[in-house]
């Protein structure tokens, strides 16, 4: 699987999950989150050659089409597969509130 | 929705479904399919700016990150959303066989 275990410990050039730290204030302009100040969101990047973790029949077709038509603009793209939530703390007045923001962290990628 | 109805009738520059015809022999190297000779597979293409048909919380975060960090390599990607099957006819000896190939046609796209 193109997950953090594999991708972070390899020099994989094809589609894989990459490290990305997002600072809530600086990168998103969100000042209201108290904790954490930022988080490891990660992102998906890399080419999707034929057979590389292809998601559907269609992505297999497109990768095969690409093999026969190099330089075509139609190609599968490396996108998130498994996403995880992020717990945050923010204040409502003086009262801290804990909430889960769903689908915030990329754990693995696929070619779609 | 970024579907064929909208995208084929507009000059949309952002993520949208685009027309692509695939010839089984020429583009995939498949000689064994009797009918059809090819089909309109379509493909997804175009940038994914903030708020443009974003798929998950994560893709919203990434688009926002991109807005704050122009030129960053982390960005949402335009990929298939709705896929449809394709019926094909091939011969097993002299006997025709009809089969559905699942997820072969792109009907709409999303930013993921």
């Amino acid at each position: 699987a193109l997950d953090t275990n594999y991708c972070f410990s390899s020099t994989e050039k094809n589609c894989c999950v990459r490290q990305l730290y997002i600072d809530f204030r600086k990168d998103l302009g969100w000042k209201w989150i108290h904790e954490p100040k930022g988080y490891h969101a990660n992102f998906c990047l890399g080419p999707c050659p034929y057979i590389w973790s292809l998601d559907t029949q269609y992505s297999k077709v497109l990768a095969l089409y690409n093999q026969h038509n190099p330089g075509a603009s139609a190609a599968p793209c490396c996108v998130p597969q498994a996403l995880e939530p992020l717990p945050i703390v923010y204040y409502v007045g003086r009262k801290p509130k804990v909430e889960q923001l769903s689908n915030m962290i990329v754990r693995s990628c696929k070619c779609s | 929705a970024l579907d064929t109805n909208y995208c084929f009738s507009s000059t949309e520059k952002n993520c949208c479904v685009r027309q692509l015809y695939i010839d089984f022999r020429k583009d995939l190297g498949w000689k064994w399919i009797h009918e059809p000779k090819g089909y309109h597979a379509n493909f997804c293409l175009g940038p994914c700016p903030y708020i443009w048909s974003l798929d998950t919380q994560y893709s919203k975060v990434l688009a926002l990150y991109n807005q704050h960090n122009p030129g960053a390599s982390a960005a949402p990607c335009c990929v298939p959303q709705a896929l449809e099957p394709l019926p094909i006819v091939y011969y097993v000896g002299r006997k025709p066989k009809v089969e559905q190939l699942s997820n072969m046609i792109v009907r709409s796209c999303k930013c993921s």
Epitope: Q57, K60 | W30, W32, Y91, G93, R94
Partner: antibody
């Protein structure tokens, strides 16, 4: 160059199942039908069935229907043939063989080295 | 199922001989203007090797001394001048009907 490398010899008891693998290299695995053919000791060739790796479409010889399952793993370009409820007359060399690509049923241009399956109590 | 009958089942020949093997199908294997008949060579302990496809087409890399002919139900494999490496068993195969079937084989031995 095209190569089909099969798993090693197996000894099985009657009633058991066997799963033979065939790893393909040197060509686009998902674009050609993969056939399975067997040959009992000193006998001729018998076609068991085939699979198209792209879609998983299969055509089985009726003689094996219900006892055989052909599958593929496209991520490793490997084809598998599982035969269940083994009998002593299933003792044979099992070959995977690539169809030449013009039709589903076709001539076969590349063959694996064969896997001997012995069924004995 | 289409039955494939090869003859002879075995033959003895010498290097340089012209050898002819025949294959008869229980029904015509012709359609779409092609004869769906193929020939293979198999040596002991080895996998079969494709020699001729669609009755008369020589597979790439196969010596030109091998040739195939025929249509309908009757087909022939000819080796124009037998070489030492040609001693093997030869099989015909049809793919006009499901299931694909093979002939019983013809063993070519050294005289």
């Amino acid at each position: 160059q095209v190569q089909l490398v099969q798993s090693g010899a197996e000894v099985k008891k009657p009633g058991a199942s066997v799963k033979v693998s065939c790893k393909a290299s040197g060509y686009t695995f998902t674009s050609y039908w993969m056939n399975w053919v067997r040959q009992a000791p000193g006998q001729g060739l018998e076609w068991m069935g085939q699979i198209f790796p792209f879609s998983g479409s299969t055509n089985y010889n009726e003689m094996f229907e219900g006892r055989v399952t052909m599958t593929t793993d496209t991520s490793t370009s490997t084809a598998y043939m599982e035969l269940r409820s083994l009998r002593s007359d299933d003792t044979a060399v099992y070959y995977c063989a690539r169809g030449i690509g013009n039709y589903a049923l076709d001539a076969m241009d590349y063959w694996g080295q064969g896997t001997l399956v012995t069924v004995s109590s | 199922d289409i039955q494939m009958t090869q003859s002879p089942s075995s033959l003895s020949a010498s290097v340089g001989d012209r050898v002819t093997i025949t294959c008869r199908a229980s029904e015509s294997v012709d359609f779409w203007g092609n004869s769906f008949m193929h020939w293979y060579q198999q040596k002991p302990g080895k996998a079969p090797k494709l020699l001729i496809y669609l009755a008369s087409n020589l597979e790439s890399g196969v010596p030109s001394r091998f040739s195939g002919s025929g249509s309908g139900t009757d087909f022939t494999l000819t080796i124009s001048s037998l070489q030492p490496e040609d001693f093997a068993t030869y099989y015909c195969q049809q793919n006009a009907e499901d299931p694909l079937t093979f002939g019983g084989g013809t063993k070519v031995e050294i005289k």
